[in-house]
Every structure is written in C-alpha cells, then in structure tokens.
C-alpha cells in the first residue's frame, strides 16, 4: 500500500500557503484528486510529489494515491482543507443527475472543518428543503440526499455559519430522473398513407418517456427531416412530437417514413409507407371463387375486398335474379375496415332457399367511379325421382324422370318380390344408364334427366327400381307391376322439403 507524507488523514492550510504531498510506493504511483488550479506534479520512480505554492479554496478536497501495479488495488488518501474566510465551500459540480431512489451526492466541500457544526442544506433563494428530504453531511464529500425522489429535483445551496451569518455556496442543480423501463414509446400516424398528387398530407411522429432526456426524429427514405419539435408533459410522461405537413404532395414525397426515438436504454423505431397516386382508384376482389355452389338449406357468406382512395361514397349488394325481385336484407350485409384504404364487405345468406339462387353483385363508388363484382350462386339439390309405365313405339317402357343438381346419374334395378327398395339379396339385374336424356338444364335450376327402360314383359312378382344419385344425395322410385295395372312406390324415406 502506498504511503503519503505528511502522514495525517487531513491537512488544514491557509490560502496562499505552500502544500507538498509526497506519495511513495513499491512501484510507480499515481495521484487522483479534484480538478483544481496551481498543482505541480513531479514523479521519480516509486515516488510522486504533488505541490502548490499558492493554495486556494479550490484545492480543498481528497487526494488519493494509488499503485496501478498493485494486484490488491491498495490506496492511501489525505484530505486537504484550504480555509478561506470568504469561501467556506468548494463546489466540485454544479449539476448532479441520479435516478429515483439513488443517493444523490451534492459535492460542496467544506473548506474549514471548524465550520461543520453550522452547516445546512437549503434550496436556492433561501427556501427550506421539501418535506421528507432525508440527507446527511460529510465535510470531505458534501451533502447526500438519500433515496432521492423526483420531486427533489431542485437547485440547492450549501450553507455555513461564519461569524454569525450564513454564507452560501454556488447553486447545485439536482436532476432526479425517473427510472426508465426502456426506450421511449413511439407512435407514427397514420400507419399507411395514400394521397393523390397535389393533395395535402400530414405525418405525425411522437415519442414519450418518463424522463425528459430522449431524442426523436423522423426520416424519409433514410434522410433525417428537419422538423420543429413540440414538447409536452402529460400523464407524468414527457412527450415530443414531430409533425410533417405537406401542402401539395408529389411523387418524391412517397416512400418509407420512420419515426425513431432513443434514450440511454436504447432505440425504438416504427415505419409507415406513403403512396402518392396520379388519380383516384377503386379495386374490388374476392378470395372466393365467383362461381359458388351450395346445398339448398345451407348458408353462405359472400366476401368482397375493396381497395380504394379516396374513401367510398356508396356501396350495396344487389340480387340480379333470375328467381325473384327480392333484394338482400341490409342486416345481412356487414362491412369491416381492415385499415384506412382496405375494407371487407360480407353478405350473409343463411339457410338458402331455392328462390335465392342466382347472381349477387357488390357495387361500390368513389370519385374514381363505379365498380362491381358479381357472384353466381347455384344451389345443389339431391335427386327427386318418378317412374311411369308407358308404351313407346308399341313397346312397353318404364320411363324414369330424375331432377337435381348436379346432374343425377341413373341406375335401374330389377329385383324379386314386391318391395319399396331393392336390397342386394333380391337384385336380379342392374342397368346403368350412362347417358340419360337431359330434359332441362337452365342456369341456377335443377337439371332434369330422363331414362328409358324397355321391358318386353313385366314380371308380376318383381319390382323395377329407378335410382338416381349426385354429390348431394340419392333418390329412388320403385315400380311394382300388379294385375290391375302398374303400381308405383316412391320410397317412404324420401320426402324432400327444401
């Protein structure tokens, strides 16, 4: 450990005195002390001499000698008082910054230890300390405000009683900063911007933090913009706002805008895109197929995405037929805004009835004009079947009519016994009709097909069944020849009510 001469903890001298402080160690040594004038430093191997031949109150302070090469980091110190009757205080710093709940050292050093009994801490202009200010004093270091609070951010003076009067130090500004949880919070509005060339635009970048010490800037395509800053203090947070006002936008104003804020904790940034267009636009699209097929009785939502600027002046859903002149109920139409320039419009069609098949059109209007998007809705039906016995060109023929959508396939079965429906054990013969005759096939309607089965002789203890099926379901009709004539049976289980 280095040794200081004179070997006393503190030294008291008068202004103008000569002071020599010598430090000796095993290796090279270094002095550290308050920044003050008139000192001369002389080093010679393992010793170092700090001297002045004109001490002033500003030389008051603690001088520490260290040995850099010492692994234990030992040091020695001596405190020097230069007792100036006119200057009881040597202030080492005029601004002290701490965080809340930290101890704040106000470094006013007493120049005469005799004065310690009459020292006090006051606020500038002779104001008393705020209530609950907990502080202590050290003649070597100054006043310490313990666990400083934000409200204690004040200007302080150290006071000493000299000859019955109070002598003040120069003021020390204490700034107690709120504990910062992270970089400033940011907002950049709007999140997206579209303007027609020549229109006005405004972009607002704002940042807030519990502490006033932070920076914020707005940049356009990596170029920092020079914008006047508006400050505010709101909800116990400091806010800084940059507002970019463009009276007449042009294409060079388009691009990426970033709002960037930083403090001791780090940096936050957020971006938006500004698009400048030549004229108004209105685009309609759908993620759905414009040709829709739904089973009767089920529901469907038709969705249209709209991209538009300026905003829509009008929109509606229209039913274009062919079944009736009914229009969609407004309560079934729903609009949601994804963001400023994109919207989704939904038409809900619950429990679809046969008369609701057809074309549905969404129409929208803005200053760019009208646009429409049309859906074609076809309903799917399970087949309905009927069979009659007739003679065609003198031949006995079973005629099966099947109606449904999609177009039904037809299969004939002949089975033993009288039954409403042939089962596998009874089947005697099966005929597939790959190409039944299409009787009617209009858009949005059921498809009706006809299949003929020529039967030379009807077997009386047998059943002839026409079966039709499509992707929705199946239907059948059993024909039972009886002596008095033909008898037909629609199956009991098939009673279709849409």
């Amino acid at each position: 450990i280095p040794v200081i001469e004179p070997s006393v903890p503190e030294l008291v001298v008068k202004p103008g005195a000569t002071v020599t402080l010598r430090c000796v160690g095993n290796g090279s040594v270094e002095w550290d002390g308050p920044p003050s004038p008139h000192w001369t430093l002389y080093s010679d191997g393992s010793s170092s001499i700090l001297s002045t031949n004109n001490a002033t109150f500003q030389n008051t302070g603690t001088y520490r000698c260290t040995e850099p090469g010492d692994p234990l980091g030992g040091s020695a110190a001596i405190h020097l008082y230069v007792k100036d009757p006119a200057r009881p205080w040597n202030v080492l710093a005029q601004e002290v910054v701490v965080f809340e709940d930290q101890d704040a050292l106000l470094p006013c050093l007493l120049t005469d230890p005799v004065l310690e009994a009459g020292v006090s801490l006051v606020r500038v202009r002779g104001r008393p300390l705020m209530r609950h200010t907990n502080y202590s004093f050290s003649p070597w270091h100054g006043f310490t405000i313990h666990r400083a609070k934000f409200i204690q951010s004040q200007d302080y003076q150290c006071s000493a009683l000299m000859g019955g009067r109070k002598v003040m130090s120069i003021s020390i500004r204490l700034k107690v900063q709120k504990v910062i949880p992270g970089p400033p919070a940011l907002t950049l509005v709007p999140a997206e911007l579209v303007r027609i060339r020549g229109e006005a635009a405004q972009i607002v970048c704002s940042a807030s933090s519990v502490d006033v010490n932070f920076d914020v800037f707005l940049q356009h395509n990596n170029t920092k913009l020079a914008i006047p800053q508006q400050s505010d203090f709101h909800n116990n947070r400091y806010q800084k706002v940059l507002t970019l006002n463009l009276d007449q936008v042009d294409f060079q104003h388009a691009g990426n805008y970033s709002c960037v804020a930083s403090n001791v904790q780090g940096k936050h940034s957020t971006s938006m895109f500004f698009r400048v267009v030549e004229s108004a636009y209105l685009n309609l699209s759908s993620e759905q197929n414009l040709i829709q097929e739904v089973t009767v009785g089920e529901g469907l939502n038709l969705k249209v995405m709209v991209e538009a600027y300026p905003g829509l002046q009008g929109f509606n859903w229209t039913y274009l037929g062919p079944f009736s002149d009914h229009q969609p109920e407004p309560k079934l139409a729903n609009a949601t805004t994804k963001d400023t320039y994109r919207h989704t419009f939904t038409l809900s069609l619950p429990r679809l009835k046969p008369s609701e098949a057809g074309r549905y059109s969404f129409l929208a209007r803005n200053p760019g004009g009208w646009r429409a998007l049309t859906f074609e809705l076809t309903l799917r039906y399970p087949p309905e079947v009927s069979v009659i016995w007739t003679f065609i060109n003198g031949s006995g023929t079973l005629l099966c009519a099947a109606s449904g959508y999609p177009q039904p396939n037809v299969t004939w079965l002949q089975c033993s016994g009288h039954t409403d429906r042939c089962d596998e054990a009874q089947v005697l013969q099966v005929w597939d009709d790959p190409y039944p005759e299409v009787l009617s096939q209009e858009p949005f309607h059921k498809v009706t097909v006809q299949s003929l089965l020529t039967v030379e002789t009807l077997e009386h203890n047998q059943t002839y069944e026409c079966r039709a099926h499509n992707s929705v379901g199946s239907g059948s009709w059993a024909f039972i020849p009886i002596s008095a004539g033909a008898h037909t049976h629609p199956p009991d289980e098939f009673l279709f009510t849409p």
Epitope: D155, R173, F233, N236
Partner: antibody, heavy 121, light 111 residues
C-alpha cells in the same frame, strides 16, 4: 432578488397580433423555465405555455397552439409572448411567471405584474 | 386535460374562524407519494401569490395559519383563524401534467 418586469398595456383590434415582453433579473436567465398565464376580466387563471431560455424548448397549451409564439432574447434576459388572430375573448391580463427553484418547476412563486391586453373594434 | 373543480364558489367566514376550501381533480395528481397540487391567493389588481406547494408545503413567508392537505384527487386548503388580510380569491393548480390547469377559484369574504 428574482423579479419579472412586464411591458405596458396594449389595445388591439380583432384579427391583429400583440407581442409583450417579460424582463427577468436577479437570477441566471437561461437556467429556468418562464411560463405565461392569462386571466380574463372576472375569470380564473389559464396556463398558455412555457419556454426554457437555455435551449428554447417550448411547451404550449394545445388550446392556443398556432396562435401563441414564445421566444427569448438571452442577451437581454427577456422573454416574449406573441398572440395572433386576436378576438374579443382574448381581452385579459397576461402574466409571466416561474418557480426559479430547479429545472422541473412544480409551482409558480414569482409573478410579473401583468400586461393588460384589450381587444376591441 | 385535468379539470380542477373548486368548492364552494364563494365563502363567508367570521374573523378568527376556520375557512376550508376544497379542490377535486378529474384524475389523480400523485407520483411516487407526492401530490403535484399547489394553492394560490389573489387579491384584486395583483398577480397570484403562492401559498402551498406539493399539497402541503408552506411557501416561505406564508403565515402558518394556512395549511394544505390531501392526495390523489381530493385536496383542501385550510385557514385556521381567518384574518382581515385573507380576503381574496383562492385557486388550486396542478403541475402533474401539461397543460397546467387551475381551479375556477373560491372567493373568501368576511361574514
């Protein structure tokens, strides 16, 4: 001691602007915020804004934003408040004030004597 | 903005009696245990004068018959023994956030 000396009374027509001054003495002008508060005849007090002469930071009451401009001349230790587009309801006594006790000013303990502004056609 | 509502609008109290003025804030004005609420006295033709800061600290040179209390949203200015020179209008003011706002004022007179 700390003092704030304000300029004399003004009479203005609607639509005009008025610029008043507040000369500070007894302290370091650049170290403390100066606030402006007005009081219409028979009415309460209304904070308008503040300026920090050290770096010319400003805080404005949004109610007056665009109509109020706060400036300082540090060489003359003087703060200025300009109010534009005057209307009859701007008739009031305008005070400059401050705390002069720290960077953050929680209260106003020094006030100017006030400048009376009358707006009349 | 924080709205401060003072009550009553006017108050008549006999000399030597206690006077109490209330101030209610539209939101809390406390931070870290301190209330950012101040009280001022204004006499006709004069600027306001600070009486109480941070809810209860008495300003230098203010007689100790004046006191302040309260926290959060409810604050009170009390004059323990009314003197003739206390006839004035009293305002509360918050410095919790900008814009700084004042109460509407309470006019105190002698009964």
């Amino acid at each position: 001691q700390v003092q704030l000396q304000q300029s004399g009374a003004e009479v203005k027509k609607p639509g005009a602007s008025v610029k008043m001054s507040c000369k500070a003495s007894g302290y370091t002008f650049t170290s403390y915020w100066i606030h402006w508060v007005r009081q219409a005849p028979g009415q309460g007090l209304e904070w308008m804004g503040a300026i920090y002469p050290g770096n010319r930071d400003t805080n404005y009451n949004q109610k007056f934003k665009g109509r109020v401009t706060l400036t300082t001349d540090t060489s003359a230790s003087t703060a200025y408040m300009e109010l534009s587009s005057l209307r009859s309801e701007d008739t009031a006594v305008y005070y400059c004030t401050g705390a002069f006790a720290g960077y953050y000013d929680w209260y106003f303990d020094v006030w100017g004597q006030g400048t009376t502004v009358t707006v009349s056609s | 903005d924080i709205v401060l509502t003072q009550s009553p609008d006017s108050l008549a109290v006999s000399l030597g009696e206690r006077a109490t003025i209330n101030c209610k804030a539209s939101q809390g004005v406390d931070y870290a245990g301190d209330s950012y609420m101040n009280w001022y006295q204004q006499k006709p033709g004069q600027p306001p004068k600070l009486l109480i800061y941070v809810a209860s600290d008495l300003d230098s040179g203010i007689p100790d018959r004046f006191s302040g209390s309260g926290s959060g949203t409810d604050f009170t200015l009390t004059i323990s023994s009314l003197q003739a020179e206390d006839v004035a209008t009293y305002y509360c003011q918050q410095s919790y956030e900008d814009p700084r706002t004042f109460g509407g004022g309470t006019t105190l007179e002698i009964k």
